[in-house]
């Protein structure tokens, strides 16, 4: 079974200090709910510098089907992968042989997920089994985050420059994966 990519585009975002990006269209719906006033998550302040415009972070969009065992989503989902190392734009490596932008003792900014969203999927299963309703966790936005020596480096492994080349059969996630996350396989590589 081949996996079909419908869309694969990269958008470079240059967040501003204190800006809280608008939710993606998938977050909009007409459900009637008891919403809490000002109940959304607070804006992050990802940078500790005045020259915010020099920092950038890329959001790569991939549209694909997701699978759970023998079952496959009825429709593809569009997910976002955070890519790149955040640094002064003029110093970001863009040619072979360019060195990294930061000093050994300087702060390390990384492009990592900022917020997550849920999307409903209907999984179609073979053998006449009833469709399964599930909700998948997708990255809603990326941010440049300043790392300190207290950060667990393992949580960043999926979100460095390697994130631009998503791994086969795995959904990039920070920290440990749940047992169920390990079952969430993609049908093929990008």
């Amino acid at each position: 079974q081949g996996w079909q990519a419908f869309k694969n585009d990269a958008t470079e975002i240059i967040p501003e200090l204190g800006e809280y990006p608008e939710p993606p269209p998938e977050l909009e719906n007409n459900k009637t709910m008891n919403r809490a006033e000002n109940g959304g998550r607070p804006p992050h302040h990802p940078f500790e510098t005045k020259d915010v415009s020099e920092y950038s972070c890329r959001e790569l969009h991939f549209t694909r089907y997701v699978t759970d065992g023998p079952c496959r989503s009825a429709k593809p989902v569009t997910e976002l992968v955070c890519s790149g190392q955040c640094g002064p734009a003029r110093l970001l490596p863009n040619a072979i042989g360019r060195g990294k932008w930061w000093r050994p003792s300087g702060p390390d900014f990384r492009c990592i997920p900022d917020r997550y969203r849920a999307q409903r999927v209907q999984l179609l299963c073979p053998g006449g089994e009833a469709p399964r309703a599930r909700k998948v966790r997708l990255v809603a936005s990326c941010k440049c985050k300043r790392l300190t020596r207290f950060h667990n480096q393992s949580e960043l492994k999926d979100f460095g420059t390697e994130a631009a080349r998503p791994q086969k059969g795995r959904k990039p996630r920070p920290r440990a994966r749940s047992a169920k996350a390990n079952q969430a396989e993609l049908e093929n590589a990008y």
């Epitope: 759970d68 917020r115 997550y116 969203r117 849920a118 309703a133 996630r173 920070p174 969430a184």
Partner: antibody
């Protein structure tokens, strides 16, 4: 693995407010969907509200609208639930519960130990 | 607001099979209600057994299974053990709102 630690037991007078905290470790709070559930002595579970990742907002059960405030401090990975205008029937164990952080959303997978709130004059 | 109904109490013999059900006042329960099942023993926090109709967790014993049965969510226990004696709660999603059932006290006797 997600772990939840809640604040200690509280004794309050009718009309007062109580604020219960729930500290997350193992994941960051912004990755998770935190909910609050209470259980009166000898009674069943009652959902109070929580973070709905489909709309990106905290939502409350209609019964508690106007009386409950849920907040999340992502800098300390701590969630708070404040209930005001307490009555004797609010005496209950208050639980925080969250999903496991996997690719598939599995809500209420990890539970805090509970915080007993006693409302008595 | 919707009301979620469960049998108040059920009894099963050790090694026997029992099915707990979870109904909705709004009509048939579907997979779109994402039925959850919890087990709670006295003095303990609830523990999730089943998510999204039939998904077991790593700690869920194989003798528990979830399904949809006659317009209700169902939790079937096959080969009951003494340690399965507990209160069982179901939960249904209605849009963004969540409603718990009243609970079923299961006795293994």
């Amino acid at each position: 693995e997600v772990q939840l630690v809640q604040s200690g037991a509280e004794v309050k007078k009718p009309g007062a407010s109580v604020k219960v905290s729930c500290k997350v470790s193992g994941y960051t709070l912004s990755e998770l969907s935190m909910h609050w559930v209470r259980q009166a002595p000898g009674k069943g579970l009652e959902w109070m509200g929580g973070f709905d990742p489909e709309v990106g907002e905290l939502i409350y059960a209609q019964k508690f609208q106007g009386r409950v405030t849920m907040t999340e401090d992502t800098s300390t990975d701590t969630a708070y639930m404040e209930l005001s205008s307490l009555r004797s029937e609010d005496t209950a164990v208050y639980y925080c519960a969250t999903d496991a952080g996997g690719f598939w959303y599995k809500f209420f997978q990890h539970w805090g130990p509970g915080t007993l709130v006693t409302v008595s004059s | 607001q919707a009301v979620v109904t469960q049998e108040p109490s059920l009894t099963v013999s050790p090694g026997g099979t029992v099915t707990l059900t979870c109904g909705s006042s709004t009509g048939a329960v579907t997979s779109g209600h994402y039925p959850y099942w919890f087990q709670q023993k006295p003095g303990q926090a609830p523990r999730t057994l089943i998510s999204d109709t039939n998904d077991k967790h790593s700690w869920t014993p194989a003798r528990f299974s979830g399904s949809l049965l006659g317009g209700k969510a169902a939790l079937t226990l096959s080969g009951a053990q003494p340690e399965d004696e507990a209160e069982y709660y179901c939960l249904l999603f209605y849009g963004g709102t969540v409603v718990f059932g009243g609970g079923t006290k299961l006795t293994v006797l």
